[in-house]
């Protein structure tokens, strides 16, 4: 969790943090679920992808997301999942050439087809939270996290360090 200094001191640096290299340092293929074990699924509808948060039937296969990890030049704080003292950012891709994007104007999370280099809206600071959970903070809007709202992914503003453990911004990663 964040230290006493809270979100503000840490997130100020996100505005001017840049990715160390244009190449990810590593990638991981995982299913993404909420703190309450609902699955994040992706459906192709009318040539675009929709993102859903739903309970899957017992033997239903979970959708996988490719997490690409990038080093930021900015040092990590206590909560960031850092490597060699550097903050980690991730992009999330459920299928080739599509990435999750933060739409800060609409407070929404969308899937967009795009080419590399990816825009800043596709990058999220990775935070390792308690109980093997992670959270994703917008690079373009510090203090704003991917969260769950009305069975959809949305962008949720977190005002204080106490709210960082709120369940609707916590996610679980698993290989199954």
């Amino acid at each position: 969790a964040f230290g006493i200094s809270g979100v503000q001191k840490y997130t100020r640096a996100l505005h001017d943090s840049s990715i160390t290299g244009i190449s990810p340092i590593t990638e991981y293929l995982a299913s993404l679920s909420t703190y309450n074990d609902q699955s994040i699924t992706f459906a192709l509808e009318d040539e675009s992808y929709e993102i859903y948060v739903e309970d899957l039937k017992k033997d239903e296969k979970k959708d996988k997301v490719l997490l690409s990890y990038y080093e930021s030049q900015h040092p990590s704080n206590e909560s960031g999942d850092g490597v060699d003292g550097k903050m980690l950012m991730v992009t999330l891709s459920p299928t080739k050439d599509f990435w999750l994007h933060a739409n800060n104007k609409e407070h929404s999370v969308e899937l967009h087809k795009c080419e590399k280099p990816l825009p800043d809206q596709a990058f999220f600071v990775l935070h390792n939270m308690h109980s093997n959970c992670v959270s994703f903070e917008c690079k373009t809007d510090p203090g704003v996290f991917i969260g769950v709202k009305d069975n959809h992914l949305a962008l949720i503003k977190v005002d204080s360090s106490e709210n960082l453990c709120t369940e609707n911004i916590l996610f679980k990663l698993s290989e199954t």
């Epitope: 190449s23 590593t26 990638e27 991981y28 293929l29 490719l66 990890y69 999942d81």
Partner: antibody, heavy 128, light 108 residues
Framework: QVQLQESGPGLVKPSETLSLTCTVS??????????WGWIRQPPGKGLEWIGS???????YYNPSLKSRVTISVDTSKNQFSLMLTSVTAADTAVYYC????????????????????WGNGTTVTVSS | EIVLTQSPGTLSLSPGERATLSCRAS???????LAWYQQKPGQAPRLLIY???SRATGIPDRFSGSGSGTDFTLTISRLEPKDFAVYYC?????????FGGGTKVEIK
């Protein structure tokens, strides 16, 4: 800073099984975003990837060695291991363990790896 | 599998000179997933460059990588005495990952 150290017998008889262990210090295998792997280098020759593993136990092997190789992980000991069966003189090499970045190829749905932290290496000679 | 050919096999240069090492792939790959390693006698390889052009942690900026498709280059802008070693390229665009045969940079 993560460090890796190989251990195991330096001499193995032909047709027997080569077993090596890599101990990771300065970081937890379980909490790492990285993969772990084995590479070998025959005397005076180049490098050959043997295989890689994620802390969950998911493995990735070089097809040329796949039938003889098993890589396993023990997160409680912060170690991962290599077993190579039916060894011959051609398996004589310096064996390195390494931390690896794994990158995914959507086209053939496979992972490939580069190694960013290496152990010092251990020499294994196959001889009777 | 992708075959990597490094040239020249040996490069004889003096300290302070610029070294240019080439790595050519048998097939083009779009990802630029190419790494460069340095290996000194009796030591393990050390990662210099990943993603064709990103320097690994702690690598001095005299080392730079470039290239795409099938042709990649490692440049050492001003050779220091400790830079004389064997250099390997490695692709990780496709499994199995493969290494080049190496280029030895020796003191002239």
């Amino acid at each position: 800073q993560v460090q890796l150290q190989e251990s195991g017998p330096g001499l193995v008889k032909p047709s027997e099984t080569l077993s090596l262990t890599c101990t990771v210090s300065g970081g937890s295998i379980r909490s790492s975003i990285f993969y772990w792997g084995w590479i070998r280098q025959p005397p005076g020759k180049g490098l050959e990837w043997i295989g890689s593993i994620y802390y969950s136990g998911r493995t990735y092997y070089n097809p040329s060695l796949k039938s003889r190789v098993t890589i396993s992980v023990d997160t409680s000991k912060n170690q991962f291991s290599l077993m190579l069966t039916s060894v011959t003189a051609a398996d004589t090499a310096v064996y390195y363990c390494a931390r690896a970045g794994g990158l995914y190829n959507w086209n053939d749905e496979s992972f490939s790896f580069y190694m960013d932290v290496w152990g010092n290496g251990t020499t294994v000679t196959v001889s009777s | 599998e992708i075959v990597l050919t490094q040239s020249p096999g040996t490069l004889s240069l003096s300290p302070g000179e610029r070294a240019t090492l080439s790595c050519r792939a048998s097939q083009s790959f779009s990802s630029s997933y190419l790494a460069w390693y340095q290996q000194k006698p009796g030591q393990a390889p050390r990662l210099l460059i990943y993603g064709a052009s990103s320097r690994a942690t702690g690598i001095p900026d005299r080392f730079s990588g470039s290239g795409s498709g099938t042709d990649f280059t490692l440049t050492i802008s001003r050779l220091e005495p400790k830079d004389f070693a064997v250099y390997y390229c490695q692709q990780y665009d496709r499994s199995p990952l493969t290494f080049g045969g190496g280029t030895k940079v020796e003191i002239k």
